[in-house]
């Protein structure tokens, strides 16, 4: 088992909103849970966009999940990752 590296980035979306993206890479096996949470609760599927789980060329995998949030509410959102029985949460950078 190889645990993922998780990286959270932000980009301007529209006025008052930002898109936050959580990327997981370098993990094996390919099964992974990656999702955005607001106040510790998973956002509904239709408010998130997921990338496919793809091989990254090193025998490991990568994927991502993104959502749009209101600027100023970043501290209420975390990326939740679960892989091979381990889990972690990752904040939005300020």
């Amino acid at each position: 088992t190889v645990p993922p590296m998780v990286n959270v980035t932000r980009s301007e979306a529209s006025e008052g909103n930002i898109t936050v993206t959580c990327r997981a890479s370098g993990f094996y096996p390919w099964n992974i849970t990656l999702s955005w949470r607001q106040d510790g609760v998973s956002l509904s599927h239709d408010t998130q966009q997921w990338g496919d789980v793809l091989p990254d060329g090193n025998g490991t995998y990568q994927t991502w999940v993104a959502t749009r949030i209101c600027q100023g509410e970043e501290q209420r959102f975390t990326c939740y990752m679960e892989h091979s029985g381990n889990h972690s949460t990752h904040p939005v950078p300020s």
Partner: antibody, heavy 119, light 108 residues
């Protein structure tokens, strides 16, 4: 001060419907997730439903899914629980609760409204 | 769904005694998503300990919480009369959210 006041409880026949309301005050209602939690007489707590601030993330307990609908009217600072196809096992005190930002958890509770399902 | 099992269901304690209750999850949960509530008869529950180990506002320092994975606990270092109540654990690691069945603490 944060205040949550439930209303709409009462006696309902099995198979009947009821709509509960929760009037919220003392905080910016449209920025907080909200829940309904119930407690049958002399029993423990049971989470019923969650709705986030923008009404775009909603979850239900398996015991009420398909029968209950949680909703909110942000301009009116009000939370609702529409209950249909009521059963005797739905008899309980229903609490409106505010979800704590960032950490989660039921940080504030109303006093509850009692729903009794009986013929 | 994640089942939370609390033990003991009932605890009779003397004043000044150390009291520990446990909450065991049916599958591993993040400590960020585990909370405890206190409820006294005829009253609404109160958030007591949040994210496993943080005391809610106004909670006496004799209370503490700990745990990880599937095993969590709440401890009262020295039991006082006002601590007699039922304590519930709660998780929102995964929907549906669930509560434990509660531990009722009484004065001996």
């Amino acid at each position: 001060d944060v205040h949550l006041v439930e209303s709409g409880g009462g006696l309902v026949q099995p198979g009947g419907s009821r709509k509960l309301s929760c009037a919220a005050s003392g905080f910016t209602f449209n920025t907080f997730g909200m829940n309904w939690v119930r407690q049958a007489p002399e029993k423990g707590l049971e989470w019923v439903a969650y709705i986030n601030s923008g009404s775009n993330t909603i979850y239900y307990a398996d015991t009420v899914k398909g029968r209950f609908t949680i909703s909110r009217d942000n301009p009116k600072n009000t939370l609702f629980l529409q209950m249909t196809s009521l059963r005797s096992e739905d008899t309980a005190m229903y609490y409106c609760t505010r979800w704590e930002p960032v950490t989660g958890g039921f940080s504030y509770w109303g006093q509850g409204t009692l729903v009794t399902v009986s013929a | 769904q994640i089942v939370l099992t609390q033990s003991p269901a009932f605890k009779s304690s003397s004043l000044g005694e150390r009291v520990t209750m446990t909450c065991t999850a049916s599958s591993s949960i993040s400590s960020s998503y585990l909370h405890w509530y206190q409820q006294k008869p005829g009253s609404s529950p109160k958030l007591w300990i949040y994210t496993t180990s943080n005391l809610a506002s106004g909670v006496p320092a004799r209370f503490s919480g700990s745990g990880s994975g599937t095993s969590y606990s709440l401890t009262i270092s020295t039991m006082e009369a006002e601590d007699a109540a039922t304590y519930y654990c709660h998780q929102h690691h995964r929907s549906p959210f669930t509560f434990g069945s509660g531990t009722k603490v009484e004065i001996k």
